[in-house]
C-alpha cells in the first residue's frame, strides 16, 4: 500500500508540474506558431486520459525566433514527458469509445494551453476526490 500511495503522490506532483509548465508556456504565446491544435474541452468521464494524450501529441511549436526559443522548446519537451501511471489511467487506455484527437475542436495556442490546464485541474480534482473516498482510482 505504501508504494502504491507513493506512486499516487508522484503522479500528483507530476500533474502539478505540468500545470506550472502550461502556465510558463502561456507567457510565450506570442512566440508560438499560431497553428490551430485539437483542444479537448468538457471531456466526458473516463476519457480524461485519452484527452490528455491528445494534448501531449499536439504539435505545439516555437516560432524559433528571438531569445526565448530554447526555453519554449524545453518546456514543450517537458509537457510531452509521460506522467507516472495510475490505475484509472491504465484502465482508460483500454477504452475504445473516447473521441479521437481529430474530432476535438481546434484552437490557437493560447486557448489550447488554457484548455490543457483546465483538464489537468480536473484530473487533479478527481484524483484527490478518489483518494478521499478510499479508492486508488484517479
Amino acid at each position: 500500500h505504501k508504494s502504491s500511495s507513493q506512486g499516487q503522490d508522484r503522479h500528483m506532483i507530476r500533474m502539478r508540474q505540468l500545470i506550472d509548465i502550461v502556465d510558463q508556456l502561456k507567457n510565450y504565446v506570442n512566440d508560438l506558431v499560431p497553428e490551430f491544435l485539437p483542444a479537448p474541452e468538457d471531456v466526458e468521464t473516463n476519457c480524461e486520459w485519452s484527452a490528455f494524450s491528445c494534448f501531449q501529441k499536439a504539435q505545439l511549436k516555437s516560432a524559433n525566433t528571438g531569445n526565448n526559443e530554447r526555453i519554449i522548446n524545453v518546456s514543450i519537451k517537458k509537457l510531452k514527458r509521460k506522467p507516472p501511471s495510475t490505475n484509472a489511467g491504465r484502465r482508460q487506455k483500454h477504452r475504445l469509445t473516447c473521441p479521437s484527437c481529430d474530432s476535438y475542436e481546434k484552437k490557437p495556442p493560447k486557448e489550447f494551453l488554457e484548455r490543457f490546464k483546465s483538464l489537468l485541474q480536473k484530473m487533479i480534482h478527481q484524483h484527490l476526490s478518489s483518494r478521499t473516498h478510499g479508492s486508488e482510482d484517479s
Partner: antibody, heavy 119, light 111 residues
Framework: EVQLVESGGGLVQPGGSLRLSCAAS????????MDWVRQAPGKGLEWVAE??????????YYAESVKGRFTISRDDSKNSVYLQMNSLKTEDTAVYYC??????????WGQGTLVTVSS | DIVMTQTPLSLSVTPGQPASISCRAS??????????MHWYLQKPGQPPQLLIY???NLESGVPDRFSGSGSGTDFTLKISRVEAEDVGVYYC?????????FGQGTKLEIK
C-alpha cells in the same frame, strides 16, 4: 543506468579531420537532446554543439568558434551521436565530452575523448 | 553571448567550514519566475556532475549541504560544511538562450 561512451579521439595535424562517436544506453535516446562540450587542457568548459530529438526534427546548433567546420549528427537506430570535425585548428585541442541535456542542465556526461591537434 | 563571471577563482577551506561561490551573468538569465542557471562540480580526473539546476534545485543524489540561490544576473552556490570530497572545480552555466556558456570555474581545495 545511463552510459555515454565517447570514441574517435586522437592526434591529428592542423587542417585535418576527425569523427567522434558517442554510444548511449540506459535512456530513451530518440527523445534526448544531445550535446558536445569540450575542455582544453587545464581550462574551463566550452559548449560546442547540440542536436535535438526527432520530435523537434533534429535541429542542430553550434558555437561560433566551430560553425562551418564541425557537424553534429545522430543515428537513433544505433543510439549514437557524432561530431564530424573538419579544418581542425590547434585551439581545438581538448577533451570532448558527450552529454545529455535533460530538461534543465547537463545531467549525464561521458568520460570524454582527447583530441590533440598538433604538427 | 551571455558572459558568466565567477568569483573567487580559487578558495581554500577548512573541513567543516562554509564556502560560497558567486556567478554573475552579463545579462539576466531569469524570466517569468524561472532562473536558467545551473551549477556543476568537476572532481579531479572526472567529467562534471550537475549539482544545482534552475538556480536553487538540488539534483538527485547531491548532498543537501549544497544550496543555490539568486535571480537575474547574480547567483550564489553555498556549501554549508565543506568535506574533503568536495574538492574540484565548480562551474556555473546558463541555459537562457544559445550559445550555452559556462563560468571560468572556481577551484576549491581543502586547507
Amino acid at each position: 543506468e545511463v552510459q555515454l561512451v565517447e570514441s574517435g579521439g586522437g592526434l591529428v595535424q592542423p587542417g585535418g579531420s576527425l569523427r567522434l562517436s558517442c554510444a548511449a544506453s540506459g535512456f530513451t535516446f530518440s527523445d534526448a537532446w544531445m550535446d558536445w562540450v569540450r575542455q582544453a587542457p587545464g581550462k574551463g568548459l566550452e559548449w560546442v554543439a547540440e542536436i535535438r530529438s526527432e520530435a523537434d526534427n533534429h535541429p542542430t546548433y553550434y558555437a561560433e568558434s566551430v560553425k562551418g567546420r564541425f557537424t553534429i549528427s545522430r543515428d537513433d537506430s544505433k543510439n549514437s551521436v557524432y561530431l564530424q570535425m573538419n579544418s581542425l585548428k590547434t585551439e581545438d585541442t581538448a577533451v570532448y565530452y558527450c552529454t545529455e541535456y535533460d530538461y534543465e542542465g547537463f545531467v549525464h556526461w561521458g568520460q570524454g575523448t582527447l583530441v590533440t591537434v598538433s604538427s | 553571448d551571455i558572459v558568466m563571471t565567477q568569483t573567487p577563482l580559487s578558495l581554500s577551506v577548512t573541513p567543516g567550514q562554509p564556502a560560497s561561490i558567486s556567478c554573475r551573468a552579463s545579462k539576466s538569465v531569469s524570466t517569468y519566475g524561472y532562473s536558467y542557471m545551473h551549477w556543476y562540480l568537476q572532481k579531479p580526473g572526472q567529467p562534471p556532475q550537475l549539482l544545482i539546476y534552475l538556480a536553487s534545485n538540488l539534483e538527485s543524489g547531491v548532498p543537501d549541504r549544497f544550496s543555490g540561490s539568486g535571480s537575474g544576473t547574480d547567483f550564489t552556490l553555498k556549501i554549508s560544511r565543506v568535506e574533503a570530497e568536495d574538492v574540484g572545480v565548480y562551474y556555473c552555466q546558463h541555459s537562457r538562450e544559445l550559445p550555452l556558456t559556462f563560468g571560468q570555474g572556481t577551484k576549491l581545495e581543502i586547507k
